[in-house]
């Protein structure tokens, strides 16, 4: 089996990930592994020479680049935070800060914005990936309520008065909890929406 550099008449190489076609000499040469770059190009008699990326730079793929890419920090002004550091083999991993979603993509997220509030009676639909899109507010399901304007508040189940030895004074709605009262006491009108003991 031929070892790079080797002649290639059809301009293709056996291992597309780790080799590349060099048209000047019509040969297949080795790519440099992630974390390295080409410090000396190949020739007919000598394969590619690779060198380690300098600190604060990286190359993620097998490559025939003559430089490494500069590590970039996650920009907090754009609402981004770091989840994994840049290394010689991988760029910095960023995500939207809590309470934000990605508003601009260019291969990766470049700008995050605040999530919209969900009004009382609704909650944000749960997404597979946090920060991927703005809130889509959905109504609380039957037997649940949510009484604030918030990007993250979840609908809670209505209180079951009988579990507390109380009786229902007013039924719960999507925006308010059940009102319970002591079975022996009448409910004053101004106490609506509270629990009496």
């Amino acid at each position: 089996q031929a070892v790079p550099p080797y002649a290639s008449e059809n301009q293709t190489c056996r291992d597309q990930e780790k080799e590349y076609y060099e048209p000047q000499h019509r040969i297949c040469c080795s790519r440099c592994p992630p974390g390295t770059y080409v410090s000396a190009k190949c020739s007919r008699i000598r394969d590619t020479v690779c060198a380690t990326c300098a600190e604060n730079s990286y190359n993620e793929h097998w490559n025939y680049l003559t430089i490494c890419q500069l590590c970039r920090p996650c920009d907090p002004v754009m609402g981004l935070e770091e989840i994994a550091p840049c290394t010689s083999k991988r760029k910095t991993q960023c995500r939207c800060q809590p309470g934000m979603f990605c508003a601009a993509w260019a291969l990766e997220c470049t700008h995050c914005e605040l999530l919209s509030d969900c009004p009382p009676g609704t909650e944000a639909e749960l997404k597979d990936e946090v920060g991927k899109g703005n809130n889509h507010c959905v109504p609380c399901k039957a037997g649940h309520f949510q009484n604030t304007s918030s990007p993250s508040a979840r609908c809670q189940p209505h209180t079951r008065c009988e579990n507390q030895g109380l009786v229902e004074a007013a039924p719960g709605t999507a925006q308010s909890d059940t009102t319970c009262k002591n079975p022996l006491e009448p409910l004053p009108p101004e106490m609506s929406g509270t629990m009496l003991m």
Epitope: T52, E55, H61, T87, R90
Partner: antibody, heavy 121, light 113 residues
Framework: EVQLVESGGGLVQPGGSLRLSCAAS????????MSWVRQAPGKCLEWVSG????????NYADSVKGRFTISRDNSKNTLYLQMNSLRAEDTAVYYC??????????????WGQGTMVTVSS | DIVMTQSPDSLAVSLGERATINCKSS????????????LTWYQQKPGQPPKLLIY???TRESGVPDRFSGSGSGTDFTLTISSLQAEDVAVYYC?????????FGCGTKVEIK
């Protein structure tokens, strides 16, 4: 030949201090991150601390933060671990390990033989 | 921190037979941009330091016999010794290097049956 040789281990009382050294040879020391990894008797491997090739970035396991300090002298091809306020649970074999990267977050491709640290009264 | 869980704790296999070791990470260690899993396997013989066997979950370190192979992606990984030799008796560890701090599994001891 690529080689890492640790030294400085020994018996120390709780609350005491120790400084470990790791002498590197056979590779361009300043190009690669280094770490300390420890192994208590019969226990798992635990990453303790890492330092980037230039020494500009350091990180520590929560269990040693504020007590241990990692450093390197690239002119001497030597890695250090200053261990203060030692506890019984720090008793372990301490290995120095090279990353195939300027950052310590990588596979450890070369390991030293280790130096034993025993914390006991 | 990403927790690495290995199974079984120990394994007894006849010479020439296959040994299979599993490693599960509490979080995904696959980096989608380059489709690499940031996971390694080490071999540690008694009284010796660990030795790198496999990186990126499936790439053998140079000089490692081809009876050792790594597979898996995301959160579930396997180290296979296709035909166990006497010199393979050791403890095997997986390690993730996807995020700080790098974390290890607690090891699987491989013995001869």
């Amino acid at each position: 030949e690529v080689q890492l040789v640790e030294s400085g281990g020994g018996l120390v009382q709780p609350g005491g201090s120790l400084r470990l050294s790791c002498a590197a040879s056979g590779f361009t020391f300043s190009s690669y991150a280094m770490s300390w990894v420890r192994q208590a008797p019969g226990k798992c491997l635990e990453w303790v601390s890492g330092i980037s090739g230039s020494g500009g970035r350091t990180n520590y396991a929560d269990s040693v933060k504020g007590r241990f300090t990692i450093s390197r002298d690239n002119s001497k091809n030597t890695l250090y671990l200053q261990m203060n306020s030692l506890r019984a649970e720090d008793t372990a074999v301490y290995y120095c390990a090279k990353s195939d990267n300027w950052h310590y977050l990588d596979a450890f491709d070369i390991w030293g033989q280790g130096t034993m640290v025993t914390v006991s009264s | 921190d990403i927790v690495m869980t290995q199974s079984p704790d120990s394994l007894a296999v006849s010479l020439g037979e296959r040994a299979t070791i599993n490693c599960k990470s509490s979080q995904n260690v696959l980096y989608s941009s380059n489709n690499k899993n940031y996971l390694t396997w080490y071999q540690q013989k008694p009284g010796q330091p660990p030795k790198l066997l496999i990186y990126w979950a499936s790439t053998r370190e140079s000089g490692v016999p081809d009876r050792f192979s790594g597979s898996g992606s995301g959160t579930d990984f396997t180290l296979t010794i296709s035909s166990l030799q006497a010199e393979d008796v050791a403890v095997y560890y997986c390690q993730q290097y996807f995020n700080t701090p790098p974390t290890f599994g607690c090891g699987t001891k491989v013995e001869i049956k």
